[in-house]
């Protein structure tokens, strides 16, 4: 199934910002022709993964969607908004054989899925069911509808420093 439609799916184009550089980087071009910038020694907190100027945390504990949302909020982040194919591929690569809540919920009154930043998701969600208003990734290569009350792992996301 096509996960991302070509229509407006809430994509934002992402690019790598100047958050990571060689440790002795300066603001001027380096001898090898790369632009390097001064930066912190760690752009993500310990045990968070860096990808395209964002930091991602994959929990090992499980909780409901609401508790997962609050957990991420407590870490200064949100449940992951997987709105580019590149980000999905990256997360598929590190989720392996587990299910993780993401920041995608079904709005019954609108009959549509929205990311928690309120952008519309027009792609495909499998396993849809009347009582499945939250979504997971992992285990399969698709977004799967899931009960918001069942406990799953979670993926949190925030900006890199």
């Amino acid at each position: 199934p096509q996960i991302f439609n070509k229509s407006n799916d809430g994509f934002t184009t992402t690019r790598s910002y100047g958050t990571v550089s060689q440790i002795f980087g300066s603001s001027s071009p380096s001898p090898n022709g790369f632009i390097t910038t001064r930066s912190y020694g760690t752009v993500c907190p310990k045990d968070w993964e860096f990808y395209q100027a964002r930091c991602f945390f994959l929990s090992t504990s499980e909780s409901s969607w609401n508790e997962s949302r609050d957990f991420c909020k407590g870490k200064g982040s949100t449940l992951a908004i997987v709105n580019t194919p590149e980000k999905l591929k990256f997360l598929q690569d590190i989720t392996d054989a587990e299910k993780y809540f993401i920041g995608l919920i079904y709005h019954r009154e609108e009959k549509r899925w929205r990311w928690i930043n309120n952008s519309v998701f027009n792609g495909n969600v499998t396993n849809q069911n009347q009582n499945f208003n939250c979504a997971t990734i992992g285990l399969t290569k698709t977004f799967d509808a899931a009960s918001c009350d069942i406990s799953y792992r979670r993926i949190c996301e925030k900006n890199a420093k």
Epitope: V20, S21, G41, T42, C44, D47, F50, Y51, D93
Partner: antibody
Framework: EVQMQQSGAELVKPGASVKLSCTAS????????MHWVKQRPEQGLEWIGR????????KSDPKFQGKATITADTSSNTAYLQLNSLTSEDTAVYSC????????????WGQGTLVTVSA | DIVMTQSHKFMSTSVGDRVNITCKAS??????VAWYQRKPGKSPQVLIY???TRHTGVPDRFTGSGSGTDFTLTISNVQSEDLADYFC?????????FGAGTKLELK
């Protein structure tokens, strides 16, 4: 400004030991993992191991067990690599490299310390 | 351990050429592969991570591709400053392992 300052070059005799240091400034090493990598000019790169400075727990390539010991001192914000029973095969540049995640690639490298083992 | 094999120890090229540097993993590593450039007396610099994501500040003539076991670093429109050693690294599992390197030199 962030820096990883490694100790200076070492010329040591076969059978001796050496302890290299890597002092971080601009960030707290407790907030990351500190890795060590061996580089030889005509050969590839070899990952030696890492330490979690917050608790001292290390993970290393079994082929370096007995050869390399990684420690850290959070009060001085410094990671160390001790190399024992040195032979000519240990002549190399040793670099420290911090990385916070568990899927480890290296955007940062210290400048490296050259260790030369020679009688 | 996962062995990363770079079959070409040396590759000859000319300025303006396109070159493909290959790396093969002994088992499936997904896309958990990085590519580095190393010049004499310098620390390595990461070019590509997660197999195809270009690192900040790296010129767009460097492109990474592949997944599973076969990976390629492509340098299009080679420049003289690109003459260096190139290494792949897998980070799917510990111990982290690197390829033996490919030296890019002028014909």
């Amino acid at each position: 400004e962030v820096q990883m300052q490694q100790s200076g070059a070492e010329l040591v005799k076969p059978g001796a030991s050496v302890k290299l240091s890597c002092t971080a400034s601009g960030f707290n090493i407790k907030d990351t993992y500190m890795h060590w990598v061996k580089q030889r000019p005509e050969q590839g790169l070899e990952w030696i191991g890492r330490i979690d400075p917050a608790n001292g727990i290390t993970k290393s390539d079994p082929k370096f067990q007995g050869k390399a010991t990684i420690t850290a001192d959070t009060s001085s914000n410094t990671a160390y690599l001790q190399l024992n029973s040195l032979t000519s095969e240990d002549t190399a540049v040793y670099s420290c490299a911090p990385y916070s995640g568990n899927y480890v690639w290296f955007p940062y490298w210290g400048q490296g310390t050259l260790v030369t083992v020679s009688a | 351990d996962i062995v990363m094999t770079q079959s070409h120890k040396f590759m000859s090229t000319s300025v303006g050429d396109r070159v493909n540097i290959t790396c093969k993993a002994s088992q499936d590593v997904g896309t958990a592969v990085a590519w580095y450039q190393r010049k004499p007396g310098k620390s390595p610099q990461v070019l590509i991570y997660w197999a195809s994501t270009r690192h900040t500040g790296v010129p767009d003539r460097f492109t990474g591709s592949g997944s599973g076991t076969d990976f390629t670093l492509t340098i299009s429109n080679v420049q003289s400053e690109d003459l260096a050693d190139y290494f792949c690294q897998q980070y799917r599992s510990y111990p982290l392992t690197f390829g033996a390197g490919t030296k890019l030199e002028l014909k």
